[in-house]
């Protein structure tokens, strides 16, 4: 084969935002008959030899950044593609608010607001069924997230997370859940 | 205590062989990583090889790849390396170093080093 | 040549203060890999002296401190004293081939 072995995938289950004491697998996926996994945790020297790292109970110092790559031969892949193992729960819980409310007409507009009592600068709202955040690049502690032109895609159940750009990877507990409704579809 | 002592080296001529060994105590040797790296005399630190706790696991500078071969016996708590083809530019004190482990995570740098063994290539 | 680039030399005075840098790439340093540090006294081998770019084993006194910051690393050494004068190296890994790498070993002098 002609270059680099491509690169293998590496994800976390049930999810990568794993409350702290729960369990997580991370599984490095490569193709058939590799000869060695390299599994290594970003910013702190360790890896281990293993394709599965199975974590009982998820701890702060396990969050952070985490990639694979294999081994056939003396060739390595390329590496896979850094996975956020976010611990959630560190913190407590941020409310989370619809203005002008949680009910609104198909094609008007919803800001979710985020708010915490603590110093964070950085939010995440997590929409039920959605595996990717909507993040919040600005860095306010009254977190604003504008939903312009809402269609029936935006209604379902949403969820936000604080936490500081110190410490990326330790979030707090997810605030209630919030329905928003769209109306008049 | 932790203990890693070389021996094997010696003089050998450009295009022979030599095998060198390295006996560890004081801790779980199978359990570990562990490599070669050698320092060629008044130069720097290369890292030749390493081999991980079952064996199976090895890798091989560019340098000496299809020449050295690293092995381990974990029943005689022994690390060894196979060097063929030797040159002049392999002459260098060779010592073995562990890799630091904590539970099951390996590390990326060297918490215990042998006293090394020198190596001589020369006709 | 060595992946990782340190200067030949460096040298102070007893008390005071010297730093050794140590420049690497995106596919080490800059990857997320760590860096490490080792001494190593004339006529003996090299002893771990910083790991985890900031930490220090049990024994190093507190003179010897390490950071990083995106592709490079630095080891500074306060207070300097006589029986500090050694090589020191800084370590790596490469992303590319998964191999170990050092740099090219900085010579420290105490001068006096």
């Known amino acids: 084969q002609s270059g680099p072995l491509p690169k293998p995938s590496l994800q976390a289950l049930p999810s990568s935002l794993v409350p702290l004491e729960k369990p997580v697998t991370l599984r490095c996926q490569g193709p058939p008959g590799v000869d060695l996994y390299r599994l290594e945790k970003l910013s702190s020297s360790r890896y281990q030899d293993q394709a599965v790292l199975f974590i009982p109970a998820m701890k702060r110092s396990l969050a952070g950044r985490y990639r694979c790559s294999y081994q056939n031969g003396s060739l390595w892949s390329l590496p896979s593609d850094q996975l956020e193992l976010v611990a959630t729960g560190v913190f407590a819980k941020p409310s989370l608010s619809a203005q002008p409310g949680p009910a609104v007409s198909s094609g008007g507009d919803v800001t979710l607001q985020c708010q915490t009592r603590y110093g964070f600068d950085q939010f995440a709202l997590y929409k039920e069924g959605d595996p990717a955040p909507y993040k919040n690049p600005e860095r306010w502690y009254r977190a604003s997230f504008p939903i312009i032109t809402v269609t029936a895609a935006h209604s379902g159940t949403y969820r936000c997370y604080s936490f500081s750009s110190r410490d990326p990877y330790l979030w707090s507990a997810p605030s209630d859940p919030l329905e928003l409704v769209v109306t008049g579809t | 205590q932790v203990q890693l002592v070389e021996s094997g080296g010696g003089l050998v001529k450009p295009g022979g062989s030599l095998r060198l060994s390295c006996a560890a105590s004081?801790?779980?040797?199978?359990?570990?990583?562990v490599s070669w790296i050698r320092q060629a005399p008044g130069k720097g630190l290369e890292w030749v090889s390493a081999?991980?706790?079952?064996?199976?696991?090895?890798q091989y500078a560019e340098s000496v790849k299809g020449r050295f071969t690293i092995s381990r016996d974990n029943a005689k708590n022994s690390l060894y390396l196979q060097m063929n083809s030797l040159r002049a530019e392999d002459t260098a004190v060779y010592y073995c170093?562990?890799?630091?482990?904590?539970?099951?995570?390996?590390?990326?740098?060297?918490?215990?080093w042998g006293q090394g063994t020198l190596v001589t290539v020369s006709s | 040549q060595s992946v990782l680039t340190q200067p030949p030399s460096v040298s102070g005075a007893p008390g005071q203060r010297v730093t050794i840098s140590c420049t690497g790439s995106?596919?080490?340093?800059?990857?997320?890999?760590?860096v490490h540090w080792y001494q190593q006294l004339p006529g003996t081998a090299p002893k771990l002296l910083i790991y985890?770019?900031?930490n220090r084993p049990s024994g190093v006194p507190d003179r010897f401190s390490g950071s990083k910051s995106g592709t490079s690393a630095s080891l500074a050494i306060t207070g300097l004293q006589a029986e500090d004068e050694a090589d020191y190296y800084c370590?790596?890994?490469?992303?590319?081939?998964?191999?170990?790498?050092f740099g090219g070993g900085t010579k420290l002098t105490v001068l006096g």
């Open positions: 170093a562990r890799h630091y482990r904590e539970f099951r995570w390996h590390y990326y740098y060297f918490d215990y």
């Open positions: 004081g801790f779980s040797f199978g359990d570990y990583y």
């Open positions: 081999i991980g706790g079952s064996g199976s696991a090895v």
């Open positions: 995106s596919s080490n340093i800059g990857a997320g890999y760590d």
């Open positions: 985890g770019n900031s």
């Open positions: 370590q790596s890994h490469d992303l590319g081939a998964h191999v170990w790498v």
